[in-house]
C-alpha cells in the first residue's frame, strides 16, 4: 500500500473478553465518505474484508465475524460483540470516495485469571538437599494475556537465586484462547522454614488498569533431623489420683523419631518400657499413686538409627489413702464421751473435717472429733473427710456409725388410723435403739421388717380390718436387750359423717418423723434415769 510507512500508529481500543468492542472509524469527511466504507481485519499481515457500508447501510461478510458485527453511531462505529482472545488484532476502515483512505484500530483483549490455586508439595522437603526442591505449584487459569507470577515467603517477594531459589513458569493455551499459567517454586529450605508461609500472586492488566490476585498461604512440610527429645505431661499442674494423665514424647525433628517411654523401676532402678497407645502416648487413666516416678523418653531415628534420650521427668500423682477411723464401730453408753480419730496418708499436707452424715453439718476441722456426754440423738453417722486443700477434688472419706446403747424408742406412742371395714390395711411401726430392736405385732397378718439404718427398724403389717380389730386396735412392740416399748394404733371407721382427717392422720403408712426429746446439757445434773421414751 503506497505511503504506508508514514501512517500514524493505530488507535488502541481495549476490551475484556466477552464484552463489546466499539470500533470507531476515524476518517474525517475530507478523507472519505463514511457512507461508503469497507472494514477489514488484519491477521498476520493478511487483510480480510469483514463488513461493508453502503449508503449508510451495513452488511457483514460471510466468515468468523458474520454474526457479531453491527453498525452504530450513524454508521461511524462498528460494534463487535462477544470479544474473544482471537479478536486481538488490527481492524481498519477504508473509505472509497473521493479517494481510498484507511484508518487503523488496534484491538487489545483482556481477561482476569481465576483465583490462583496453590498446591504444596505433599512429600515435603528435606533441609539437607543438594539443590532446590519443589516447594509448591501455583496455577492461574483462563487469563489473557499471560499474567505475571510473583512468589512470596512470609510476605516478602522471592527472587531467583542461584542454587537457592528457582521459579519455573509455563503456560498453556486453552481452546478458548485463554492462557493457563503454571509456576513451580523450587527452593532450598532450612529448618526455620517449617513455619514459613508461602503464597503466589498473579499480576494482570485490564482496561481499567493493573490488578493482582493472591493465593491462600501454605506451609510446606520441612524435614530436618531431631536434635532433642522431651516429655510433656497433660494436664499441667498438680495431678491427682483418678485424673486422666497423658505422657507424650516430643521431638524437635520432622518427621519425629520412633518414641518409647520408660519408667524407672523404684526397686531395681532399671528403666522399664511402658505400653503406649497407637499415637505413642502413655495414657494413665485413672492415674494412681503407683504411677508416680521417673519417666524418660527415647527417640530412635529409623533412617539413621541414631537414638536420643530425653531429660528424665518426675511425675507425682498426688493421692489420699483410704481413710481410717478409730474406733471403727464405736458403741457407747448414753452420757459417756467418745473420741473419734481419723487417719490417712497423702503426698501433700492433709486437712481433716468431721461432718454429721444426716445433716452435712461440719462438726470439727481436724482429725480428732470429741463427743461429750453422748445423748441417744448423737447416734448415727459421722463422716471424716481427708482432703488436700491445694488440689481441688482430691479427698477421701470414711463413714463411721456411732451406736448409743438404749432401749427401743418408738416413732410414735399412739396414732389414730382411719379405715374402712374389710379393707386390707397397711400399718407401719418404726423404732430405734441399740442394739437395733426387733418389732412384733399383737395381731396376725403379713409382717415384714426393714432395717433403716444400724439403729432403726421399720416393720410393716398387712392386716384385714375386722370388727374385732376395730375394737382392740393394733399394738406393735419393739424390743432389744435393754428393754421393750409399745405403740398403739387405734382404728377408726370412716363414714359419711366423719370429717376429712387432718394432716396428722393417715390411712396408710403410720410413721412419723417428729424430733426426739432432748435433755438439758449441763456440767453435772441430777436426773431422772434415762428411759425408753416415745416420741410422737
Amino acid at each position: 500500500v503506497p505511503g504506508e510507512a508514514e501512517q500514524p500508529a493505530p488507535e488502541l481500543v481495549e476490551v475484556e473478553v466477552g464484552s463489546t468492542a466499539l470500533l470507531k472509524c476515524g476518517l474525517s469527511q475530507s478523507q472519505g465518505n463514511l457512507s461508503h466504507v469497507d472494514w477489514f481485519s488484519v491477521h498476520k499481515e493478511k487483510r480480510t474484508l469483514i463488513f461493508r457500508v453502503r449508503q449508510g447501510q451495513g452488511q457483514s461478510e460471510p466468515g468468523e465475524y458474520e454474526q457479531r458485527l453491527s453498525l452504530q453511531d450513524r454508521g461511524a462505529t462498528l460494534a463487535l460483540t462477544q470479544v474473544t482472545p482471537q479478536d486481538e488484532r488490527i481492524f481498519l476502515c477504508q473509505g472509497k470516495r473521493p479517494r481510498s483512505q484507511e484508518y487503523r484500530i488496534q484491538l487489545r483483549v483482556y481477561k482476569a485469571p481465576e483465583e490462583p490455586n496453590i498446591q504444596v508439595n505433599p512429600l515435603g522437603i528435606p533441609v539437607n538437599s543438594k539443590e532446590p526442591e519443589e516447594v509448591a505449584t501455583c496455577v492461574g487459569r483462563n487469563g489473557y494475556p499471560i499474567p505475571q507470577v510473583i512468589w512470596y515467603k512470609n510476605g516478602r517477594p522471592l527472587k531467583e537465586e542461584k542454587n537457592r531459589v528457582h521459579i519455573q513458569s509455563s503456560q498453556t493455551v486453552e481452546s478458548s484462547g485463554l492462557y493457563t499459567l503454571q509456576s513451580i517454586l523450587k527452593a532450598q529450605l532450612v529448618k526455620e522454614d517449617k513455619d514459613a508461609q508461602f503464597y503466589c500472586e498473579l499480576n494482570y492488566r485490564l482496561p481499567s488498569g493493573n490488578h493482582m490476585k493472591e493465593s491462600r498461604e501454605v506451609t510446606v512440610p520441612v524435614f530436618y533431623p531431631t536434635e532433642k527429645v522431651w516429655l510433656e505431661v497433660e494436664p499441667v499442674g498438680m495431678l491427682k489420683e483418678g485424673d486422666r494423665v497423658e505422657i507424650r514424647c516430643l521431638a524437635d525433628g520432622n518427621p519425629p523419631p520412633h518414641f518409647s517411654i520408660s519408667k524407672q523401676n523404684p526397686s531395681t532402678r532399671e528403666a522399664e518400657e511402658e505400653t503406649t497407645n497407637d499415637n505413642g502416648v502413655l495414657v494413665l487413666e485413672p492415674a494412681r499413686k503407683e504411677h508416680s516416678g521417673r519417666y524418660e523418653c527415647q527417640g530412635l531415628d529409623l533412617d539413621t538409627m541414631i537414638s536420643l534420650l530425653s531429660e528424665p521427668q518426675e511425675l507425682l500423682v498426688n493421692y489420699v489413702s483410704d481413710v481410717r477411723v478409730s474406733p471403727a464401730a464405736p458403741e457407747r453408753q448414753e452420757g459417756s464421751s467418745l473420741t473419734l480419730t481419723c487417719e490417712a496418708e497423702s503426698s501433700q499436707d492433709l486437712e481433716f473435717q468431721w461432718l454429721r452424715e444426716e445433716t452435712g453439718q461440719v462438726l470439727e476441722r481436724g482429725p480428732v472429733l470429741q463427743l461429750h456426754d453422748l445423748k441417744r440423738e448423737a447416734g448415727g453417722g459421722y463422716r471424716c473427710v481427708a482432703s488436700v486443700p491445694s488440689i481441688p477434688g482430691l479427698n477421701r472419706t470414711q463413714l463411721v456409725n456411732v451406736a448409743i446403747f438404749g432401749p427401743p424408742w418408738m416413732a410414735f406412742k399412739e396414732r389414730k388410723v382411719w379405715v374402712k371395714e374389710n379393707m386390707v390395711l397397711n400399718l407401719s411401726c418404726e423404732a430405734s435403739g441399740h442394739p437395733r430392736p426387733t418389732i412384733s405385732w399383737n395381731v396376725n397378718g403379713t409382717a415384714s421388717e426393714q432395717d433403716q439404718d444400724p439403729q432403726r427398724v421399720l416393720s410393716t403389717l398387712n392386716v384385714l380390718v375386722t370388727p374385732e380389730l376395730l375394737e382392740t386396735g393394733v399394738e406393735c412392740t419393739a424390743s432389744n436387750d435393754l428393754g421393750k416399748n409399745t405403740s398403739i394404733l387405734f382404728l377408726e371407721l370412716v363414714n359419711l359423717t366423719t370429717l376429712t382427717p387432718d394432716s396428722n392422720t393417715t390411712t396408710g403408712l403410720s410413721t412419723s418423723t417428729a424430733s426426739p426429746h432432748t435433755r438439758a446439757n449441763s456440767t453435772s445434773t441430777e436426773r431422772k434415769l434415762p428411759e425408753p421414751e416415745s416420741r410422737g
Epitope: R332, Q333, E334, G335, S336, S337, L338, H372, D373, L374, I404, F405, G406, P407, S479, N480, D481, L482, G483, K484, N485, R519, N521, S522, T523, S524, T525, E526, R527, K528, L529, P530, E531, P532
Partner: antibody
Framework: EVQLLESGGGLVQPGGSLRLSCAAS????????MSWVRQAPGKGLEWVSA????????YYVDSVKGRFTISRDNSKNTLYLQMNSLRAEDTAVYYC?????????????WGQGTTVTVSS | SELTQDPAVSVALGQTVRITCQGD??????ASWYQQKPGQAPVLVIY???KRPSGIPDRFSGSTSGDTASLSITGALADDEADYYC???????????FGGGTKLTVL
C-alpha cells in the same frame, strides 16, 4: 483385766461425813457409767447412785438425795461418793459397779466393797 | 413399785430350778440377775433378753413373760448355792430396783 477397788470406808458418827473412792483399771473408764450399790448387814442389795461416763448426768435413790454426791475424775480413773449427814441406816458395805450398757442397765463388774459404819 | 422374789428356793442336785422375779417394770425392762456368795461381791449371771457374760456356764438362762422374769438353772451344782438378786428399773424411770433376793439351796 477389769478391776475396781473401793476405799474410804470406816466408822463415823451420825451426822458425820465420809468420802468413798473407787479406783478403776483395765478398761476405758470414761466410756462407762458407774454406780454405787450398798448392802446393809444381813440384807439385800440397794442401788444408791449412778453417774454417766462423762460425768454430765447423775442419779440418786430418794433416800440419799441432798446428802450424797457422786462424781468422777476421768483423768484419774476414779469414782467418788461424798456422803454427808450420815445416818445409822446408811451403815452398809458399799460397792462400786460398772454398768455394761449405760446408766443402771446391768452391772458387769463389782469391787470387793468398803464398809461404812454409822454409829455413836 | 417393787421387784418381788421368793425368799428361798431349793433344788435337788442335778435338777432344774426356776427363780422368779415379779414387777410392773419388767413389762418394759429386762431383769439382770446376780449371784452372791457369802462374804463376796455380787456376780452378774444374766442380763438383757437372755445374755450371759463370759465365764458364766450355759446352765444359766433367763426369760420374761409379762411382768415376770425368770432365772433357770439346769443341772444344779452344789457350787450354785448362793443368794440370787434380780435387778431392773422402775417403770416410772425414777429408781433402780433390786429384788429382795432368793436364797438357793442345793440338796
Amino acid at each position: 483385766e477389769v478391776q475396781l477397788l473401793e476405799s474410804g470406808g470406816g466408822l463415823v458418827q451420825p451426822g458425820g461425813s465420809l468420802r468413798l473412792s473407787c479406783a478403776a483399771s483395765g478398761f476405758t473408764f470414761s466410756s462407762y457409767a458407774m454406780s454405787w450399790v450398798r448392802q446393809a448387814p444381813g440384807k439385800g442389795l440397794e442401788w444408791v447412785s449412778a453417774i454417766s461416763g462423762s460425768g454430765g448426768s447423775t442419779y440418786y435413790v430418794d433416800s440419799v438425795k441432798g446428802r450424797f454426791t457422786i462424781s468422777r475424775d476421768n483423768s484419774k480413773n476414779t469414782l467418788y461418793l461424798q456422803m454427808n449427814s450420815l445416818r445409822a441406816e446408811d451403815t452398809a458395805v458399799y460397792y462400786c459397779a460398772r454398768d455394761i450398757w449405760g446408766v443402771t442397765t446391768a452391772f458387769d463388774y463389782w469391787g470387793q466393797g468398803t464398809t461404812v459404819t454409822v454409829s455413836s | 413399785s417393787e421387784l418381788t422374789q421368793d425368799p428361798a428356793v431349793s433344788v435337788a442336785l442335778g435338777q432344774t430350778v426356776r427363780i422368779t422375779c415379779q414387777g410392773d417394770s419388767l413389762r418394759s425392762y429386762y431383769a439382770s440377775w446376780y449371784q452372791q456368795k457369802p462374804g463376796q461381791a455380787p456376780v452378774l449371771v444374766i442380763y438383757g433378753k437372755n445374755k450371759r457374760p463370759s465365764g458364766i456356764p450355759d446352765r444359766f438362762s433367763g426369760s420374761t413373760s409379762g411382768d415376770t422374769a425368770s432365772l433357770s438353772i439346769t443341772g444344779a451344782l452344789a457350787d450354785d448355792e448362793a443368794d440370787y438378786y434380780c435387778h431392773s428399773r422402775d417403770s416410772s424411770g425414777d429408781q433402780i430396783l433390786f429384788g429382795g433376793g432368793t436364797k438357793l439351796t442345793v440338796l
